[in-house]
Interface confidence: low
């Protein structure tokens, strides 16, 4: 067959076994309906096709699989399990496919999966065992190196009365399966806080993107064990100040670059330690652009240009003198 083929006719759908494994023998040259395949590039693209399930007849040579812009809704256990297995699949992009439910073991039987992108899906349900594949206290290590979870927050009314942050963190922690993860992107998820142990099971992280969330504080988060961390993106959050414990932990990471732009820094007496740290550190990229948002009298002042005399806290007025 030609290196690039596009199947226009629907191939017969494979019968599914109880374990959701396709038993249909696959011809190396075949390509699923509504997909474009390049055997030379080891790539299959089923993009913007309104698919409601993962094609069963994926060619065994696939290394890069794009299933973006579809209507998958649910990703069941063994969604990519095949006979023979998709042993070479290394990069899987499912972004913007209206996924609402990723079930336990959805990515099982993908021994080479290095990159997974689930961005721009309204994940109302993300199983704690979505990435680990089992509910064992210690799971087999996942081969994942990059996990992209930007803008996966569902609409408010579809959150099942659960903490979205907690749901995501549970999936990241389960069984220690993601010990080898190097990149984690969690941008644009309306996170209000980071659970205390969010990073405990991710010791190999090099790049962590938490930008464009609603984080107000990092007080309970520990970065201490992330000794390989190279970039930490905290731009466009609601951070008011970084306290001594956080500053010390960031300073102790030998390779890190921290991005803090576009946070509403409150330049009062609580900011003194952070300003002193900013003047000394080289870990903050763009530190000369950081400015105060509050109080009003300090708005747009450059943090690095402040001294201790600028950073005062107004005495608290007794209730009788307070105005609404």
């Amino acid at each position: 067959s030609s290196p690039t083929s596009s199947a226009s006719s629907s191939s017969s759908s494979a019968p599914f076994l109880a374990s959701a494994v396709s038993a249909q023998p696959l011809l190396p040259g075949q390509c699923p309906a509504l997909c474009e395949c390049s055997e030379a590039a080891r790539t299959v693209k089923c993009v913007n096709r309104n698919l409601t399930e993962v094609p069963t007849d994926l060619p065994p040579y696939v290394r890069n699989l794009f299933l973006t812009g579809n209507q998958l809704a649910v990703l069941p256990a063994g969604a990519f399990a095949r006979v023979p297995p998709l042993a070479e699949l290394a990069a899987l992009n499912l972004s913007g496919s209206r996924l609402e439910d990723v079930q336990a073991g959805a990515f099982e039987h993908l021994p080479s999966l290095r990159q997974l992108d689930l961005s721009h899906n309204p994940l109302a349900v993300l199983s704690p065992f979505a990435f680990s594949g089992s509910n064992a206290s210690v799971s087999a290590p996942s081969p994942l190196v990059e996990l992209i979870l930007n803008h996966i927050v569902p609409p408010e009314d579809e959150r099942n009365n659960r903490s979205f942050e907690g749901m995501v963190v549970a999936a990241l922690r389960a069984g220690g399966a993601l010990h080898g993860l190097h990149r984690l992107e969690l941008a644009s998820n309306h996170f209000l806080y980071l659970p205390r142990d969010v990073l405990a099971q991710l010791p190999s992280l090099r790049h962590l993107d938490l930008s464009n969330n609603s984080l107000v504080s990092l007080t309970y988060v520990s970065f201490r064990n992330l000794t390989h961390l190279e970039s930490l993106h905290l731009e466009d959050n609601a951070l008011k100040v970084l306290h001594n414990g956080t500053l010390a932990e960031l300073q102790g990471l030998p390779h890190v670059r921290v991005f803090l732009d576009n946070n509403p820094w409150v330049c009062d007496c609580h900011m003194a330690d952070m300003v002193a740290w900013l003047k000394e550190t080289e870990v903050v990229q763009g530190k000369y652009q950081l400015t105060c948002a509050f109080p009003e009298k300090m708005r747009n002042r450059v943090l690095l240009e402040l001294n201790s005399a600028d950073l005062d806290c107004d005495p608290i007025l007794p209730p009788s003198l307070q105005t609404s």
Epitope: S231, P254, E282, G286
Partner: antibody, heavy 117, light 108 residues
């Protein structure tokens, strides 16, 4: 593996401008800072500035501000440096280097600039 | 700006000799951000020691680095022919980033 491939040698006249390139491969271009470093023949190393392609943050050595312009094209994973109002003092080898506060791990092979009438 | 002064400017050493190159900063530098590079004629510099004392990938164990504050050093426990090169110290503690003028190490 990581590679930084720099553009060919340049021979330009005094007062002119030059734009040299540094094409990155083998890593995610938007994740790492690229610095530019000048080395005159038989001399030491001088930092010109750095660019972070991920957010287009740029820092210059005050000495080169106004004459050096650093840019990056994410689509081609290429960093550029333009130098204007050239004089013979600008004749040197210019290196791009990848890394940051933990050292410049990878360097380009250098672009030789000769400014002569 | 932080000025890094390297001494000596040129040094000759015999095979097997212990060699120490020094780098003095005009003001204190965080030891995480003090690095050394090796450069041979016609080649690009190579990261040799990072964060004062960590050997870069592929650097022989006979090299070591130490120091803090304003005083740093690179030591070769036993000089070999391939070590002949120019060594630069470099600080990433304050902008502008600066390099020392280099120490040229020659084989005697």
């Amino acid at each position: 593996q990581v590679q930084l491939q720099q553009s060919r040698p340049e021979l330009v006249k005094p007062g002119a401008s030059v734009k040299m390139s540094c094409k990155a491969s083998g890593y995610t271009f938007t994740d790492y800072v690229i610095s530019w470093v000048k080395q005159r023949t038989g001399q030491g190393l001088e930092w010109i500035g750095e660019i972070y392609p991920g957010s287009n943050s740029i820092y210059y050595n005050e000495k080169f501000k106004g004459r050096a312009t650093l840019t990056a094209d994410k689509s081609s994973s290429t960093a550029y440096m333009q130098l204007s109002s050239l004089t013979s003092e600008d004749s040197a080898v210019y290196f791009c280097a990848m890394g940051g506060n933990y050292g410049f791990d990878y360097w380009g092979q250098g672009t030789t600039l000769t400014v002569s009438s | 700006q932080i000025v890094l002064t390297q001494s000596p400017a040129i040094m000759s050493a015999s095979l097997g000799e212990r060699v120490t190159l020094t780098c003095t900063a005009s003001s204190s530098v965080n030891s995480n951000y003090l690095h050394w590079y090796q450069q041979k004629p016609g080649s690009s510099p190579k990261l040799w020691i990072y964060s004062t004392s960590n050997l870069a990938s592929g650097v022989p164990a006979r090299f070591s680095g130490s120091g803090s504050g304003t005083s740093y050093s690179l030591t070769i426990s036993s000089m070999e022919a391939e070590d002949a090169a120019t060594y630069y110290c470099h600080q990433y503690h304050r902008s502008p980033l600066t390099f020392g003028a280099g120490t040229k190490l020659e084989l005697k």
